[in-house]
């Protein structure tokens, strides 16, 4: 009797996902270090040359809070957009009928901390569309799996996610 080849015939079990705990962050290093999202490169304003680095996200599977009614929350870097779009699919698969919701994206109002990655479109604060806070720990885990470079269960009210800068070597190499 010939046994199955490597991986052949074995039942593949989906990866067991464990929710993040409140105040936990992955990776377990500071956000703006090399092992996470990397250094702050400077605030982007509507008038700045770098504003063109931001791209609007019109994914219909993502709900944007847009409290300012300016569309600012939809603006983000391409890497952030890619990770967010991947996460949107995961959320719908995890909780049918529920969508990903963005409460903060790029910020021009200045009500985040100094050198926040929100100011350069590299960070988003997210919830589920039903705003069921018992889901947020798992939402954070899904964000890690979607490839965000740093994920933080920052608040009872949202998960903070950020990415490396577009010009960083790690981002270019897909690391």
């Amino acid at each position: 009797i010939i046994g199955p080849g490597r991986g052949f015939g074995k039942r593949r079990h989906p990866k067991k996902l464990t929710p993040l705990a409140y105040k936990q962050f992955i990776p377990n290093v500071a956000e703006k270090t090399l092992g996470a999202s990397g250094r702050y490169e400077g605030k982007i304003t509507r008038n700045s040359e770098r504003f063109k680095e931001l791209t609007p996200n019109y994914n219909p599977d993502i709900i944007f809070k847009d409290e300012e009614n300016t569309g600012a929350d939809r603006l983000m870097t391409q890497r952030c957009k890619d990770k967010l779009n991947a996460l949107a699919i995961s959320v719908m698969n995890q909780w049918p009928g529920v969508k990903l919701r963005v409460t903060e994206g790029w910020d021009e109002d200045g009500h985040h901390s100094e050198e926040s990655l929100h100011y350069e479109g590299r960070a988003v604060d997210i919830t589920t569309s039903d705003r069921d806070r018992s889901k947020y720990g798992m939402l954070a885990r899904l964000a890690v799996e979607a490839g965000f470079d740093w994920v933080y269960y920052e608040s009872k009210a949202h998960i903070h996610c950020s990415v490396k800068a577009e010009n960083s070597v790690a981002a270019k190499s897909g690391g």
Epitope: E67, K156, A157
Partner: antibody, heavy 123, light 105 residues
């Protein structure tokens, strides 16, 4: 520092509209992150949130009052206003304007309050 | 609609610790704040974000929140702390508790 001051009539007839204005001094109503709010306190001491408005014009109302309430903002005058229609004696209360801060996703806390104005509904 | 329940009254001897509770379904998932109100005055925020104190509020005021119950603790209560205390929480609809009258005997 920022201060809030309510103004408006102290007596309103039943079925009429209660109108109050809150003037913000010492700071701009345009500041992001704040929700300008109305809260009332009935003679029995209970506090009741009426509603809040963001500088962008987005409004949030107490579901039990929503059909009768309108909150608006006038950024040029640094004021926001309350209109409550079809009032009855049950609307007699001290009305406060307050500044709401957001702890999270609409997790408001009110860190600044006006002195309050008593509005009596009576014919 | 969401409800927050507080005991109508709490008594404490001067220098002792007073605890005022506030209960609501899954309250631990929400941020809770507390207000102090003295007769004829506007409410004053004493705790926000479950356990943070605004500047000017004495250290004897502290807060906690988990499960279905939030607690305001006043360590070493003083006569000046005698007042009505209200908890408040909610999301996109602020809800207040019914208030607790604290008596410092």
């Amino acid at each position: 520092q920022v201060q809030l001051q309510e103004s408006g009539p102290g007596l309103v007839k039943p079925s009429q509209t209660l109108s109050l204005t809150c003037t913000v001094s010492g700071g701009s109503i345009n500041s992001g992150g704040f929700y300008w709010s109305w809260i009332r306190q009935h003679p029995g001491k209970n506090l009741e949130w009426i509603g809040s408005i963001y500088y962008s014009g987005n409004t949030y109302y107490n579901p039990s009052l929503k059909s009768r309430v309108t909150i608006s903002v006038d950024t040029s005058k640094n004021q926001f206003s309350l209109k409550l229609t079809s009032v009855t004696a049950a609307d007699t209360a001290v009305y406060y304007c307050a500044r709401g801060n957001d702890s999270g996703d609409y997790d408001w806390y009110f860190d600044l309050w006006g002195r309050g104005t008593l509005v009596t509904v009576s014919s | 609609s969401y409800e927050l329940t507080q005991p109508p009254s709490v008594s404490v001897s001067p220098g002792q610790t007073a605890s005022i509770t506030c209960s609501g379904e899954k309250l631990g998932y929400k941020y809770v704040c507390w207000y102090q109100q003295k007769p004829g005055q506007s409410p004053v925020l004493v705790i926000f974000h479950d356990n943070k104190r605004p500047s000017g509020i004495p250290e004897r005021f502290s807060g906690s929140n988990s499960g279905n119950t939030a607690t305001l603790t006043i360590s070493g209560a003083q006569a000046m702390d005698e007042a009505d205390y209200y908890c408040q929480a909610g999301d996109s609809s602020a809800v207040f508790g019914g208030g607790t009258k604290l008596t410092v005997l």
